[in-house]
Interface confidence: medium
């Protein structure tokens, strides 16, 4: 009976040993899987974070596009209305022009002599920009940056004159110190008869032949109203 008990005990020990080994293997396996799951979770978390960030950026970008689209749509619907009508009013700014305070502005990216720039604007049924306030000065300055740019002001026939007839004497001025000086020392012949924005926005008179950038301006008609979106 004793030997039988010992046999059973050995059997139980073996079974228990197998069970322990098996359990250890399972625990080891679970632990590995757990590590994998942890890693997978981390990976999924970072992917989710990235997707959220991308989505947020896409959303911002989409908002900008929608804003631009609405603006373009308004502009196009206005132009369609203008083209379908028979009046001679300019009710909205043409494509590629910037509207500000009931005027339309176009900013060149190339250079021309003052007379050619003046001609270019007039061929758009517009004129070189006429600056009538500090607010308009800031607006133009913001768009042109630190680049020499012609405006619609000259004294080629004697006194300083704005191209649209705005009174120079009583109007807004933003000359650099010591300017205008009608300097003859440049060696190009004659003085300096045309005004331009300098790199800091303040004005200087220069030789009219210099190929500077320029800004065209045309006024929207007083009676016009913004059309509803279609």
């Amino acid at each position: 009976q004793n030997s039988q008990l010992q046999e059973e005990l050995r059997g139980l020990r073996e079974t228990f040993s197998n069970f322990t080994a098996s359990t250890e293997a399972q625990v080891k396996g679970l632990s590995t899987q757990g590590g994998n799951v942890g890693r997978k979770m981390k990976s999924l978390e970072s992917q989710l974070e990235k997707q959220q960030k991308d989505l947020s950026e896409d959303h911002s970008s989409l908002l900008l596009h929608v804003k631009q689209f609405v603006s373009d749509l308004r502009s196009l619907s206005c132009q369609m209305a203008a083209l379908q009508g028979n009046g001679s009013e300019r009710t909205c700014c043409p494509v590629n022009w910037v509207e500000h305070e009931r005027s339309c502005y176009w900013f060149s990216r190339s250079g021309k002599a003052w007379a050619d720039a003046d001609n270019y604007c007039r061929l758009e049924d517009a004129h070189l920009v006429v600056v009538t306030s500090w607010e308009e000065q800031k607006f133009v300055q913001h768009h042109i940056g630190p680049v020499n740019t012609w405006m619609g002001l000259h004294d080629q026939n004697g006194p300083w004159k704005w191209v649209d007839g705005t009174d120079y004497e009583t109007g807004f001025k933003n000359w650099r110190p010591e300017q205008p000086d009608d300097w003859y020392g440049h060696g190009l012949g004659g003085g300096e008869d045309c005004a331009h924005f300098t790199d800091d926005g303040r004005w200087n008179d220069d030789v009219c032949q210099r190929p500077y950038r320029w800004v065209c301006e045309t006024e929207l008609d007083k009676a016009s109203q913004e059309p509803p979106l279609l």
Partner: antibody, heavy 122, light 107 residues
Framework: EVQLVQSGAEVKKPGSSVKVSCKAS????????INWVRQAPGQGLEWMGE????????FYAQKFQGRVTITADKSTSTAYMELSSLRSEDTAVYYC???????????????WGQGTTVTVSS | DIQMTQSPSSLSASVGDRVTITCRIS??????LAWYQQKPGKAPKLLIY???NLAEGVPSRFSGSGSGTDFTLTISSLQPEDFATYYC?????????FGQGTKLEIK
């Protein structure tokens, strides 16, 4: 449909004047510039001038300055080109053309009239 | 004034040929150039505007290239109806000068 229809052929004496008309239809007349271009027999195209009917602002080629007058009648959507002190060298086909409206970008003449033959002969 | 030099002044070619016409300008006009086709007794017809843009209804065998001072009109495969005179024109301020023209004839 955009159309520019010009007046008929003219025979003129040297020293006189001629007035050619160009009636526009199918678009808003005041929204586009109207240009005038001429072509002498067997020769190339020569730009004469432009008018903006919206503002009545005009531009003329130096060669014709003082001899050409371009006008526009908004009520009838018609542009006119008058050339004075005619000489035999003015014998040509005169075209009106609409300047395509791409503000702040390149221009182009997208629609042309059929042409008006002006003969200057004594 | 801006000077336009169009070349060649005349050109003989056959149906199916590839043809190139050039226009050289005396100063930088950026992309402010148009090309026209004119047939005898007819008004000119716009082909290309802003140097490279195909006008409405113009076959895709016509193409424009160049900017600044050198421009090219190319017809990739000549068709019988393409035999005509071609003109370039600048729009870099007045006067809006035309090139002298290129007469394209059947060989």
């Amino acid at each position: 449909e955009v159309q520019l229809v010009q007046s008929g052929a003219e025979v003129k004496k040297p020293g006189s004047s001629v007035k050619v008309s160009c009636k526009a239809s199918g678009y808003t007349f005041t929204a586009y510039g109207i240009n005038w271009v001429r072509q002498a027999p067997g020769q190339g195209l020569e730009w004469m001038g432009e008018i903006f009917p919206r503002s009545d602002q005009t531009f003329y080629a130096q060669k014709f300055q003082g001899r050409v007058t371009i006008t526009a009648d908004k009520s009838t959507s018609t542009a006119y080109m008058e050339l004075s002190s005619l000489r035999s060298e003015d014998t040509a086909v005169y075209y009106c053309a609409r300047k395509g409206r791409e503000y702040g970008t390149s221009h182009y003449f997208d629609y042309w009239g059929q042409g008006t033959t002006v003969t200057v002969s004594s | 004034d801006i000077q336009m030099t169009q070349s060649p002044s005349s050109l003989s070619a056959s149906v199916g040929d590839r043809v190139t016409i050039t226009c050289r300008i005396s100063e930088n006009i950026y992309s402010n150039l148009a090309w026209y086709q004119q047939k005898p007794g007819k008004a000119p017809k716009l082909l290309i505007y802003a140097a490279i843009n195909l006008a409405e209804g113009v076959p895709s065998r016509f193409s424009g290239s160049g900017s600044g001072t050198d421009f090219t009109l190319t017809i990739s495969s000549l068709q019988p109806e393409d035999f005509a005179t071609y003109y370039c024109q600048h729009f870099w301020g007045t006067p809006f000068t035309f090139g002298q023209g290129t007469k394209l004839e059947i060989k």
